[in-house]
């Protein structure tokens, strides 16, 4: 049920899951100079019943200075298999995500965790794409990719997204620019 490969790469775009299907694993990775505690689980697992989903296990990191090493903990071979990273971590407001049935929300950060989270996605997971700063989206459909099982093999669907430079026009039919920008956002940024 695990997805065999990474979600598609889109030039000048990053992807993010807004919620994680039950069965998803998150590696307990620690930042440089820290390691997973001896008794600690190597991953967190999204589990649930009919009414509620939550992350089993807690990731915990401890200083590795006592061992006279600053090397980041290396995942076991089975952990390295099917490494998935999500790239828009800081842009999600964890308290305000929609609660999708059968999904776990983004786990809160743990002390001394690594800068990049590594997920092991399962069939049915959706990830969402966003153009990086300085690029705008040309799109006619959802910029989503879903991990699907077809003929016994997993594959990710292709998101309908192209990210183009700021100077190129890319408006939707019917789109209008805001007349004022009370939020202090750059008015020059015309839209997708």
């Amino acid at each position: 049920e695990l997805c065999d490969d990474d979600p598609p790469k889109i030039t000048h775009a990053t992807f993010k899951a807004v919620a994680y299907k039950e069965g998803t694993m998150l590696n307990c990775e620690c930042k440089r100079g820290f390691r997973r505690i001896k008794s600690g689980s190597p991953y967190m697992l999204c589990t649930g019943n009919s009414s509620h989903s939550s992350w089993d296990n807690q990731c915990q990191c401890t200083s590795s200075a006592a061992r006279n090493t600053t090397k980041q903990v290396t995942p076991q071979p089975e952990e390295q298999k099917e490494r998935k990273t999500t790239e828009m971590q800081s842009q999600m407001q964890l308290a305000d995500q929609v609660s999708l049935p059968g999904h776990c929300r983004e786990p809160p950060p743990w002390e001394n965790e690594a800068t990049e989270r590594i997920y092991h996605f399962v069939v049915g997971q959706t990830v969402y794409y966003q153009c990086v700063q300085g690029y705008r989206a040309l799109h006619r459909g959802p910029a989503e990719s879903v991990c699907k099982m077809t003929h016994g093999k997993t594959r990710w669907t292709q998101p309908q997204l192209i990210c183009t430079g700021e100077t190129e026009p890319s408006q939707f039919p019917g789109e209008e620019e805001p007349q004022a920008s009370p939020d202090g956002l750059p008015e020059s940024e015309t839209s997708r």
Epitope: K16, V18, Q91, C131, R136, E144, D183, E189
Partner: antibody, heavy 130, light 107 residues
């Protein structure tokens, strides 16, 4: 709790304008886009447009282009929909509904949303009659 | 724009019976289809998103299926509170569009 509360019923003459307000509460205003949908008496649902509260960008249905204006005020977490040059066929219940955007940062300017219209206002009745 | 056609226009059934509602798109909408329920004098309520996923708090008797152009909403055993109008809506292309609705009435 999460809710969208709309302004009251309006009676307008043909050619006039109407402004319907939608006050959001109980959630982070910028994280959700607001759709406007209307329903004429005994009819189905018709989409008017969408506004991204971050930056105030809008997309309007072609049918209402030039007649509809959607704005938002982040300080009061209110979204307004104004429809001008009213005619009798604009008589309808007007709804605002939220959808969650993909990205939640303060500079997100696109219109990508997921899930569905999970919270709706109670509706505002607009009657156009001479 | 994508046209969604719902059938039948009206479905007359008794409580406890199974209801099968259809929504057909004029072109593929992948799985980007939602179903809403609307009762008289009320705003619509999200039932199903992305063709087959029940929204939060929706009873298990509601299920959705289909992809591409043909979609089905099934109510396995009608409860008295299920008699209402049901709309499908696509988010695959701009503008978002709704079907014309199917009324499920008591026989």
């Amino acid at each position: 709790q999460v809710q969208l509360v709309q302004s009251g019923a309006e009676v307008k003459k043909p050619g006039a304008s109407v402004k319907v307000s939608c006050k959001a509460s109980g959630y982070t205003f910028n994280s959700y886009y607001i759709h406007w949908v209307r329903q004429a008496p005994g009819q189905g649902l018709e989409w008017l447009g969408i506004i991204n509260p971050t930056g105030g960008r809008t997309i309007y249905a072609q049918k209402f282009q030039g007649r509809v204006t959607m704005t938002r005020d982040t300080s009061t977490t209110t979204v307004d929909m104004e429809l001008s040059s009213l005619r009798s066929e604009d008589t309808a219940v007007y709804y605002c509904a939220r959808v969650p955007g993909y990205c939640k940062d303060t500079s997100c300017q696109d219109f990508y949303y997921y899930y569905g219209m999970d919270v709706w206002g109670q509706g505002s009745t607009v009657t156009v009659s001479s | 724009e994508i046209v969604l056609t719902q059938s039948p226009a009206t479905l007359s059934l008794s409580p406890g019976e199974r209801a099968t509602l259809s929504c057909r798109a004029s072109q593929s909408v992948s799985s980007y289809l939602a179903w809403y329920q609307q009762k008289p004098g009320q705003a619509p309520r999200l039932l199903i998103y992305d063709a087959s996923n029940r929204a939060t708090g929706i009873p298990a008797r509601f299920s959705g299926s289909g992809s591409g152009t043909d979609f089905t909403l099934t109510i396995s055993s009608l409860e008295p509170e299920d008699f209402a109008v049901y709309y499908c809506q696509q988010r695959s292309n701009w503008p978002p569009t709704f079907g014309q609705g199917t009324k499920v009435e008591i026989k």
